[in-house]
Interface confidence: low
């Protein structure tokens, strides 16, 4: 989906915009495209030559509270005979996403945006071989 | 909403769930991590299911640059360096959250947006459908 462009300026007339305290911004966490679904090929985590497992991390003071992390099952890759080939390497593929972190300081609550690195899956790579002199 | 443990010494007026709208500190934690996958690793070239990285640039989004992976082949690269069509290169997709300015033109008002990105490719055994 091509996202339509919207204009932006930092010097708009304040009366048309929500009042915001200095050093902070207003963030609506009702997510655009909330119901979008990933349409990945079926069971690729098991069918991959570099298979992986999923772990769900849960943090009540993070939005979204659930973040799914992948872990490669093997150091090597699975060959045509279904055996692990350690001449190849399973490596994680990572992607950054934003989360909102809630912080409690005494009885006051503040919110902070945070970049989180998510391991999405694994791929099989030829290793880098370092020759020792 | 998300239920959170409340400090018992605090007044009961505190909302246990994440409110729909929050005031967020402008400083993003971990914001300076490396966002260019070409710089962070060369897996896209060394993989048996290699991919190209395409720059998706949108000045009205944060982050403004997102790298999209496109698998180079339908098959996977075998030990001889040839494409093996008995295996399939498939994209690994991930939903990520980004910021979009809303309402338009307002300097300090944003909304989270979920977008689907292809992060890389992996080599899989194909699903074979046998026709009766």
């Amino acid at each position: 989906r091509k996202i339509p462009k919207v204009g932006h300026t930092f010097f708009q007339k304040p009366e048309s915009c929500p009042p915001v305290p200095g050093g902070s911004m207003k963030l609506d966490i009702g997510i655009i495209n909330e119901n979008q679904r990933v349409s990945m090929s079926r069971n690729i985590e098991s069918r991959s030559t570099s298979p992986w497992n999923y772990t769900v991390t849960w943090d009540p003071n993070r939005y979204p509270s659930e973040v799914v992390q992948a872990q490669c099952r093997n150091l090597g890759c699975i060959n045509a005979q279904g055996k692990e080939d350690i001449s190849m390497n399973s490596v994680p593929i990572q992607q950054e996403t934003l989360v909102v972190r809630r912080k409690h300081q005494g009885c006051s609550v503040s919110f902070q945006l945070e970049k989180v690195l998510v391991t999405v899956g694994c791929t099989c790579v030829t290793p880098v071989i370092h020759h020792v002199q | 909403g998300i239920t959170i443990p409340r400090n018992p010494g605090c007044p009961n007026s505190e909302d246990k769930n994440f409110p729909r709208t929050v005031m967020v500190n402008l400083n993003i934690h971990n914001r300076n991590t490396n966002t260019n996958p070409k710089r962070s690793s060369d897996y896209y070239n060394r993989s048996t299911s290699p991919w190209n990285l395409h720059r998706n640039e949108d000045p009205e989004r944060y982050p403004s640059v997102i790298w999209e992976a496109k698998c180079r082949h339908l098959g996977c690269i075998n030990a001889d360096g040839n494409v093996d069509y008995h295996m399939n290169s498939v994209p690994i997709q991930q939903e990520i959250l980004v910021l979009r300015r809303e309402p338009p033109h307002c300097p300090n008002s944003f909304r989270l947006e979920k977008i689907l990105v292809s992060v890389g490719c992996t080599c899989v055994t194909p699903i074979v459908h046998h026709v009766a």
Partner: nanobody, 119 residues
Framework: EVQLVESGGGLVQPGGSLRLSCATS????????MYWVRQAPGKGLEWVAE????????YYVDSVKGRFTISRDNAKNSLYLQMNSLRAEDTAVYYC????????????WGQGTLVTVSS
């Protein structure tokens, strides 16, 4: 690699003029709003001016309106700030910045150019 390089700063008397330039590379210059931001000695950052992607709209902080003019040349990937009727309170390091969507937060800054207004 994204680069922003400012030039044109210096010492000038009150009422004088300077023209700051910012040469950019490493990103699609014509797709971004661009900004001049300044930091006076011992003070925080202050927004000075903004110019939209195509140069059609310009915005200024009240204290420089009518005295400063922001402009850009997309063919040369360059940003400019013409400063007239300079005052002592305009003394600051001036930075150009790429218009990342987050206000007050830029992925890329120049190294800055010092403007000193003094008699």
């Amino acid at each position: 690699e994204v680069q922003l390089v400012e030039s044109g700063g210096g010492l000038v008397q009150p009422g004088g003029s300077l023209r700051l330039s910012c040469a950019t590379s490493g990103f699609t210059f014509s797709s971004y709003g661009m900004y001049w931001v300044r930091q006076a000695p011992g003070k925080g950052l202050e927004w000075v001016a903004e110019i939209k992607q195509d140069g059609s709209e310009k915005y200024y902080v009240d204290s420089v309106k009518g005295r400063f003019t922001i402009s850009r040349d997309n063919a040369k990937n360059s940003l400019y700030l013409q400063m007239n009727s300079l005052r002592a309170e305009d003394t600051a390091v001036y930075y150009c910045a790429k218009g990342e969507i987050l206000p007050l937060y830029f992925d890329y800054w120049g190294q800055g150019t010092l403007v000193t207004v003094s008699s």
